[in-house]
């Protein structure tokens, strides 16, 4: 069974998948479609790196540009380094600028919805 066939079988169970499962899935060549990706739990998507999302979505990663104003895509973009976003070749903007340090202050983030940044 290839990655795409595997994805079809598990698609209906993915809604509540934790980050760890999504990271594991990104190694399986599943090419998750964007509609399924956007139904995932936001808190599970946010910790994923650009490389992991690229592997998870495969060719469908291109659709992030078309859906950049919708959650969880919008929130995920805000969490990524701009340099990493640039590798997607989509012209996505809003990532963390080069030279900034991300502080994982979960209370601050829970209140504001955005990560806390320290300038260069």
């Amino acid at each position: 069974m290839n990655g795409s066939e595997y994805f079809v079988k598990i698609q209906s169970f993915l809604g509540g998948a934790p980050t760890e499962d999504l990271k594991a899935l990104s190694q399986q060549n599943v090419s998750m479609d964007l509609a399924t990706f956007m139904k995932l739990r936001t808190d599970a998507v946010l910790p994923l790196t650009v490389a992991e999302v690229q592997k998870l979505l495969g060719p469908h990663v291109e659709g992030l540009k078309a859906e950049e104003r919708h959650r969880p895509v919008r929130d995920w973009i805000l969490r990524q380094r701009q340099d990493d976003l640039d590798t997607l070749g989509l012209g996505l903007q809003g990532g963390i600028p080069n030279g900034y340090l991300v502080l994982d202050l979960s209370m601050q983030e829970a209140l504001s919805g955005t990560p806390c940044l320290l300038g260069p």
Partner: antibody
Framework: EVQLVQSGAEVKKPGASVKVSCKAS????????MHWVRQAPGQGLEWMGN????????YYNERFMSRVTMTVDKSTSTVYMELSSLRSEDTAVYYC??????????WGQGTLVTVSS | DIVMTQSPDSLAVSLGERATINCKSS????????????LAWYQQKPGQSPTLLIY???TRESGVPDRFSGSGSGTDFTLTISSLQAEDVAVYYC?????????FGGGTKVEIK
């Protein structure tokens, strides 16, 4: 003004390979993916695959997986599509098309590839 | 693969009259989160490359005349030309961009009656 200029028509023998180029201008080359679509004479459109011009990552329609290779040259804002082991049914017009998000917003003029012994 | 079925295969319409083209997909093209339908319409005039008319099922591409409109959701979609002009003679294709391989309908040829 966005422009996609493709290489000229080719005539190839069965079993040979063909490499079609698509030179882009009028926009930031690394901000938009490029797709390849073909159209056999008098027939409809068939998606072959797409490529991320920033990283060079490419994805192919499984129908062509073993025979197609898409590459990019950022220095000249050019993408390439190579199709190997050509057969007569590969005779078609091959188009490059720039993505607008997922849809194909701009198309090249097309390159006719004729496969004949 | 998602199968796209267009109807009719060809259509002859008088100048100034309405032309309606249907496109049906074998599975939903709706993103239930964003409410976007991943369907595009293209026009291909004789001897030319295709051009984009509509994306997200109903969003008209910049520069496309407002006589062209797209509608539908899920699996059933329609392209309407409200008042056919001579320059609209072409083949029209729908395409899904929900899941690879992105697939096209077989095309509908629109002619003047």
């Amino acid at each position: 003004e966005v422009q996609l200029v493709q290489s000229g028509a080719e005539v190839k023998k069965p079993g040979a390979s063909v490499k079609v180029s698509c030179k882009a201008s009028g926009y930031t080359f690394t901000n938009y993916w490029m797709h390849w679509v073909r159209q056999a004479p008098g027939q409809g459109l068939e998606w072959m695959g797409n490529i991320n011009p920033s990283s060079g990552d490419s994805y192919y329609n499984e129908r062509f997986m073993s025979r197609v290779t898409m590459t990019v040259d950022k220095s000249t804002s050019t993408v390439y599509m190579e199709l190997s082991s050509l057969r007569s049914e590969d005779t078609a017009v091959y188009y490059c098309a720039r993505s607008g998000g997922l849809w194909l917003a701009f198309w090249g003029q097309g390159t006719l590839v004729t496969v004949s012994s | 693969d998602i199968v796209m079925t267009q109807s009719p295969d060809s259509l002859a319409v008088s100048l100034g009259e309405r032309a309606t083209i249907n496109c049906k997909s074998s599975q939903t093209l709706l993103n239930s989160v964003s409410q976007n339908n991943y369907l595009a319409w293209y026009q291909q005039k004789p001897g030319q490359s295709p051009t984009l008319l509509i994306y997200f099922a109903s969003t008209r591409e910049s520069g496309v005349p407002d006589r062209f409109s797209g509608s539908g959701s899920g699996t059933d979609f329609t392209l309407t030309i409200s008042s056919l002009q001579a320059e609209d003679v072409a083949v029209y294709y729908c395409q899904q961009h929900y899941r690879t391989p992105y697939t096209f309908g077989g095309g509908t040829k629109v002619e003047i009656k």
